[in-house]
Amino acid sequence: HNTTVFQGVAGQSLQVSCPYDSMKHWGRRKAWCRQLGEKGPCQRVVSTHNLWLLSFLRRWNGSTAITDDTLGGTLTITLRNLQPHDAGLYQCQSLHGSEADTLRKVLVEVLADPLDHRDAGDLWFPGESESFEDAHVEHSISRSLLEGEIPFPPTS
């Protein structure tokens, strides 16, 4: 799986989108999990409604929300009041039984609030990617890694 980088500003909300094949994943609940290292386990943060037909209803766990457009095939995760500790590797998952398919791997990066001068030294201002080599910029908030790219990056 390629990894897509989503950058958000500290204190603001970040929306992460995970597109998927709506037919292939028909009837499946979805989940958002936090990965503990690139090869580590993925800890469930939040999952969609227990009733698949109600997956469009937004579900919250703390400051993280999930909603699923099952017809359009887009899972959307919202991280509210983004903080430095929210940085890390995540996965969008499609659940079936006790198994989970990875829809997208996501690296969340937290940028400094340019209007907040008090902690300007504590957060990273947007600029060159420090985590990945030759990262492809898709949008202002996300970019994808090319196949086989190593996150040339963050540690334990």
Epitope: G37, E38, K39, P84, H85, A87, T155
Partner: antibody
Framework: QVQLVQSGAEVKKPGASVKVSCKAS????????IHWVRQAPGQGLEWMGW????????KYAPKFQGRATITADTSTSTAYMELSSLRSEDTAVYYC?????????????WGQGTLVTVSS | DIQMTQSPSSLSASVGDRVTITCHAS??????LSWYQQKPGKAPKLLIY???NLHTGVPSRFSGSGSGTDFTLTISSLQPEDFATYYC?????????FGQGTKVEIK
């Protein structure tokens, strides 16, 4: 019991090569990244490089690029670090270190260390 | 490479003291910082990962804080077994780099 067991101490002449092994027990090395870190006598820790045994891909600190070779044999769950063109300043304890990689790994295992002495 | 600078290089303290060690990164490293403890003749042991997360089995008197470029390791009440050398290590980019170490000695 989860552990990394390294090969024994070595004494080498300048210009020679040394190959240190690191055998994992209690876990499979494919599920981890294996790093090599060295520590010269009375000095701090220095990261040398890393291998993903599952993919066979390795990365090195610029200082060791071309002189260090990190390999892994998944069938025996053993990682190796070979250092060539040895000089006296390579005298150090060499550690292997396993973790789940970047972005918040909660797994962290170290070998007991292998002392490599380079002396004429 | 990202340079990691620890201070102080060494300190003397008594059992029960509150000890603070700082680590400064030459570039922004977000929260990708680990703290290790090393005793003479032994391999390093992970104390803190991701700047502030306590590793399994590590006593709660150890704590970490910081993000960006400045980080702190605090030992709230120094115990006899805490006399050792402490290293920070960044994980924002490879090569991973360590601070030069802080030796905590008995006063």
């Amino acid at each position: 019991q989860v552990q990394l067991v390294q090969s024994g101490a070595e004494v080498k002449k300048p210009g020679a090569s040394v190959k240190v092994s690191c055998k994992a027990s209690g876990f499979s090395i494919e599920d981890f990244y294996i790093h090599w870190v060295r520590q010269a006598p009375g000095q701090g820790l220095e990261w040398m490089g890393w291998i993903d045994p599952e993919q066979g891909e390795s990365k090195y600190a610029p200082k060791f690029q071309g002189r260090a070779t990190i390999t892994a044999d998944t069938s025996t769950s053993t990682a190796y670090m070979e250092l060539s063109s040895l000089r006296s300043e390579d005298t150090a304890v060499y550690y292997c270190h396993a973790d789940h990689g970047n972005y918040g790994s909660t797994m962290d295992y170290w070998g007991q260390g292998t002392l490599v002495t380079v002396s004429s | 490479d990202i340079q990691m600078t620890q201070s102080p290089s060494s300190l003397s303290a008594s059992v029960g003291d509150r000890v603070t060690i700082t680590c400064h990164a030459s570039q922004h490293i977000n929260v990708w910082l680990s703290w290790y403890q090393q005793k003479p003749g032994k391999a390093p042991k992970l104390l803190i990962y991701k700047a502030s997360n306590l590793h399994t089995g590590v006593p709660s008197r150890f704590s970490g804080s910081g993000s960006g470029t400045d980080f702190t390791l605090t030992i709230s009440s120094l115990q006899p077994e805490d006399f050792a050398t402490y290293y920070c290590q960044q994980g924002q980019t490879y090569p991973r780099t360590f601070g030069q170490g802080t030796k905590v000695e008995i006063k």
